[in-house]
Each structure stands twice: as structure tokens, then as C-alpha cells.
Amino acid sequence: KIDACKRGDVTVKPSHVILLGSTVNITCSLKPRQGCFHYSRRNKLILYKFDRRINFHHGHSLNSQVTGLPLGTTLFVCKLACINSDEIQICGAEIFVGVAPEQPQNLSCIQKGEQGTVACTWERGRDTHLYTEYTLQLSGPKNLTWQKQCKDIYCDYLDFGINLTPESPESNFTAKVTAVNSLGSSSSLPSTFTFLDIVRPLPPWDIRIKFQKASVSRCTLYWRDEGLVLLNRLRYRPSNSRLWNMVNVTKAKGRHDLLDLKPFTEYEFQISSKLHLYKGSWSDWSESLRAQTPEEEPTGMLDVWYMKRHIDYSRQQISLFWKNLSVSEARGKILHYQVTLQELTGGKAMTQNITGHTSWTTVIPRTGNWAVAVSAANSKGSSLPTRINIMNLCEAGLLAPRQVSANSEGMDNILVTWQPPRKDPSAVQEYVVEWRELHPGGDTQVPLNWLRSRPYNVSALISENIKSYICYEIRVYALSGDQGGCSSILGNSKHKAPLSGPHINAITEEKGSILISWNSIPVQEQMGCLLHYRIYWKERDSNSQPQLCEIPYRVSQNSHPINSLQPRVTYVLWMTALTAAGESSHGNEREFCLQGKAN
């Protein structure tokens, strides 16, 4: 009922709570002497559904049959209208339209941990739109029945708030949930389980790892578990991997030896627990333990290469280069590299430890036979040394690879191809392809890159440290015993026309011809490998086409003579540079007038 209803009553038949689709009769009746003063037959009773007028009647009462009410709550209000006055509220009623509860489905119960509480979930089915009470009931041994009621409006979860104990782990319990509202009731199918079925252990905790004698091969994982745990599963992986290694263990009692861990690797470990071989469920995975395994002495051998440079008649410079061991070979933090240089006939040896670099340069006599050995050391020991004899890598002309070419192969790759040397190709033990950025000064500080190729290969794709629009000097070495032959070529992965032309810095006259000198184009403006320079000239103030001279590009060249100029004529000269992609813009213009006689 709404408000005090002093003036009259609203009654609802058959009930204030009805099934969707049902019809209700609503009666509004005035109490004695509560109609319009003096004109009781003028009483006009009006029935409102919310704010909408749906019926009216003159007299002391009004009857209305209402159908098609929607799910939920509908408010009806009865008002009295008298002549010359506002409508007066008489009384009202709420009608609740809903449905009987559907059978709850998929009832399932779980207890999280041996000390946890039993909680059950289910699916309610469609909304009843009415106050519906859910009662969760659990029947167990000793003829006992536990139950709890749900006070929430949408109830699909209930926690008993108490704990099942393992005193009879195989005893059966049967759960059932019953939904009741004004229109009916329905119970779920029973769900029967034992303690072992519903207790989901807490994840293991306090996970630790120990390496006996700081060795990766003697590793034990320790953890703590709830008392009844029978099974564990362990998973572990290197921190940079997505794939887990899995191990199942029974009656581990909080420890397990791991035998297949890699040295000097950060691993992530997790553990899960279960109470019974085939009953119940696995716990959540424990929090991760992250731990680094100890170092072991390096395996594998360094890949070493070298470069020789003539200094003078008695001395030569040797630059040694080596590549870092892979993580799996280094098996620890490399603390230093040990380089030993030995003159093989005299037996003199010099050893040096190098930290922070993967190269070493020294000066040795040009006489004698020299060998080097390089090894990598971590806290546990050293790798096997890589030994190489220092020789003149390009001395054997007959071992030089033939028809070397370098072609761009996609983004930042160069495909180098060659033909075996003329000399017996089967004598080749391996090819080495070496590349470095081309610097006009022949700078020895420019990083050197190399890769080794099997003797039956006649191509190699180079991609390491290759940048677009940079020219590389590429050498292919064929090695056979203590001999080597080489061929070289320039190559780039991507090219375009140079951004500028050479800058003419001087023009000098020599015996009737001129010598033009220029500054090299800065490397970053060359935009690939230069193929040619062009020198252009024309008479000043002339509109004729310029003449030109094309010079093949050579790294060290920066001057060229021209002998086809007329004396006492002023010429304008300029230069351009070309890559395979095209010609640069003009360099600077210089004027020159030849004084002497033409040849």
C-alpha cells in the first residue's frame, strides 16, 4: 500500500505478486463520508498506472481489470476528482510481475586450501524480477545437514564461512541449492563430492633454490606446502623463453633435484600442488621464483680473424679481431680475453689479458713465423684457445676467388657471390667474407666484420652491421693450409644519387694541360658506392653544351689531368659523382684560363 490510505482502499486480486501474463483486478473504494462534499454522486474515481490515467468511474468504488503488465514493479494510484478542486490521492498499490525461479544449474563447490571455507557457485537462470531467496544445503555423514541462505538480490554464490576438515577425506557430501519466491520454487540437481574433490590446495610458498658447490648440475628446489599435498608439478623456463619445462613429482615433501638447467641463465620457477592422484584440482601456480644459475667454464672456441698492415721495411701491424661467444658458450660473464702471440721458430711468446674489447693491435717484425692464440675466460675457467698462423692472406694469386660480385638483397643485406679459384678448387679449406665501411683514408679503426663459409659454398649473405646508403669494401678470402688468396669488390645494400658533387679545391697548369684536384664527398653524402666522377667544362658566357670527362672511381684518387683546353680562354669547371642510382648535383664551379700553348 502507498501512504496512509485514510480516504479509501485499493485492493488487488488475486495477489500483489503475479505471474507474467496474468490478469489482476484492482478495486478502489472510498471509505464512508470521504467523497466529494454535498455531491457524493459527483464522485469521480480515477485509476492511474504510474502517471497515466487508465480508468475512471462516478460513484463510491471503481473496478478495473488489468492485463499485459510488464516484468517488474508497476505502481497504481487511485485519485478522487471533485468539481472545482484538485484531484485528491485516495490510495495506491504496487504490483510485482515476475516468474518462478528456473532450476539452478552447474552447482559447484570449492574450498581454497585446507584452512579455507567452502563456497559454492551456480547459474541462476533467467531473472525472476521478484525477491527470490536461495538456500544452499549440504548433507553429510552422521545424518547432518548444513544450510545457509542468501540475502543478495542476485544470488549465484554463497560461502558457508566454515571449513571442511580431512578427518574422513573419502566421506560423501551432497550439495543442493533451492530458489524460492512467491511464484514457486526449484532445486538444483544434487552435487556429490568428498573433501579430496573440493579442496583446492593453496599454492606452494617460500620457494628457494640451492646450488651445491656452486654447480648447476647439483641443484635442488625447495618449497613449503599444505600438509596433505601428495602431488606437485614444477614448471621452469629461462626468463627470456615462452616455453615451460614441466615435471610431475609424487611425495616430493617440498624438494626436488633439477638436472637439466643451463649455466649462467636466469630461470623462472613455479610450483603447483594437488591432494590426490585423480581426485580434486591443482592449486594455482605459486608466485614465481627467479634465480640465476651459477657459471661454468666456457665451451666452444672464439671465431678469430686478423688484418695485416705494412708499416715499413722491417715492421708490420697486426690487428686481431674476435667475436663474442654466444651466451650458451660463454656460460658466464666473460671477464677477459687472453691473447698469446708467439714467434714459432724462436719460441718467444707474449701474453696479454684484454678486457672490454674484442680486438687487439700490435706491431711485430716482418720476419719470422708468427702465431696467435685467443681464449675467453669467466670466473670458472677459460675456453679452448683458437690458434691461427699469421700469413699474408692475399699472397697466393692462384687461390684468389674469381668473378666476385656484390648485389643488394632486400633491406640491409648484400649477397656476395664468387667462383672458386683457378687453382684446384678442392684445395680450398674455407672461404672468409670480410666487409667494412669504405673510408677514403683507409682508416684502420673502422670496425671489421667477417663470416666463414664452407669450401663448397660460392655465395654468402651479409647482413650484420650493414647500413643503407653506405659503401662497403668486401673481400673474399680462399684459405688453404698456410696460404691464402683474395679478391675484393665494393658493394652497398641500398643506393641513390649522391647528395653533392666533389669540391674542386685547386686547378694548376702543367705543360699545357691542367691538373684538377678535389676533396672527396663526405661519406654520409655519397649514398652508396661511387662508380665514376665527371669533370665538366665550358667556355665562360657560352651557351654551348659542356664537355665532360668521366673517371672511374678509385678510393685514393683525388686529382686528374685534362689536356683539351684552349689557351687564353676562360673556362668554367665543375664536378659530379655517380652511383648506380644516378648523378649528384654540381659541386662548386671554378674558373680557369690556361696561359700556355695548347698541345
Epitope: 571455507t117 545457509k148 560461502d159 558457508f160 564461512g161 566454515i162 571449513n163 578427518e167
Partner: nanobody
């Protein structure tokens, strides 16, 4: 100090009803499990009903549907409504209180720390 005092016992005809009450002082009933036990002459004390601190009720199947346990936090009391009484319900009824958090423990006498003196219920045929 904790005290439990039962009331509401008496004589009643078979089929009748009684409402027993247990008033508690010294501890809030909302924080504890509350139980009712009974002992008939010459028999062992037996479990009748209990209510956990989390509002889970437990009954033996022999009384389920006839007996209801409820808590009145405002009065710091627990009630036992008994309907359709039978002569075999004749016994001294005891109220008990304890910090019990397990299903099985709610029906076990030795889990309850505090006990009342009991109230007599007699059902005649």
C-alpha cells in the same frame, strides 16, 4: 567472564511448540558458533542444532524441519524454535558457545568452550 542462561523450557502436549532462549553475557554471540544439545534421562548428550558465526545452520536429519535455530544480536541471545514436538523430544536442553570454524566441529560437544545449566523440556502424549 562468559555466562549462558537458558530459558523457555516447560511441559507441552505432543504436537505443540516451545521457544527456548539462551542469553549470553561477556561475549558477543555474533562472533561465535552457538549450539543446542539435549540429554534425555539415562542417555548420552546429543546434538540438536547449531549456528556458525557466518550464519550457517546445521541440524541432524531427525529434527530437520521441526526445529529452527536463530540469533538475536540485539539481545545477545540465541533461540531454538521447536514445533510438532514428540514425547522423544523430552530432555534437558543445553545451550553452548565456542569459536568453531569447521563443518564437523559444529555438531561436536568438545568443540564448545562455554555451556549453560540447561532447561527441562517435557513432552507428554
Amino acid at each position: 567472564q562468559v555466562q549462558l542462561q537458558e530459558s523457555g523450557g516447560g511441559s507441552v502436549q505432543a504436537g505443540g511448540s516451545l521457544r527456548l532462549s539462551c542469553a549470553v553475557s561477556g561475549r558477543p554471540v555474533s562472533d561465535y558458533a552457538m549450539g543446542w544439545f539435549r540429554q534425555a534421562p539415562g542417555k548420552e548428550r546429543e546434538f540438536v542444532a547449531a549456528l556458525s558465526a557466518s550464519d550457517t545452520t546445521v541440524y541432524p536429519n531427525s529434527v530437520k524441519g521441526r526445529i529452527t535455530i536463530s540469533r538475536d544480536n540485539a539481545k545477545n541471545a540465541v533461540d531454538l524454535q521447536m514445533n510438532a514436538l514428540k514425547p522423544e523430544d523430552t530432555a534437558v536442553y543445553y545451550c553452548a558457545m565456542g569459536p568453531i570454524g569447521t563443518f564437523q566441529g559444529l555438531a561436536r560437544q568438545n568443540e564448545y568452550h562455554y555451556w549453560g545449566q540447561g532447561t527441562q523440556v517435557t513432552v507428554s502424549s
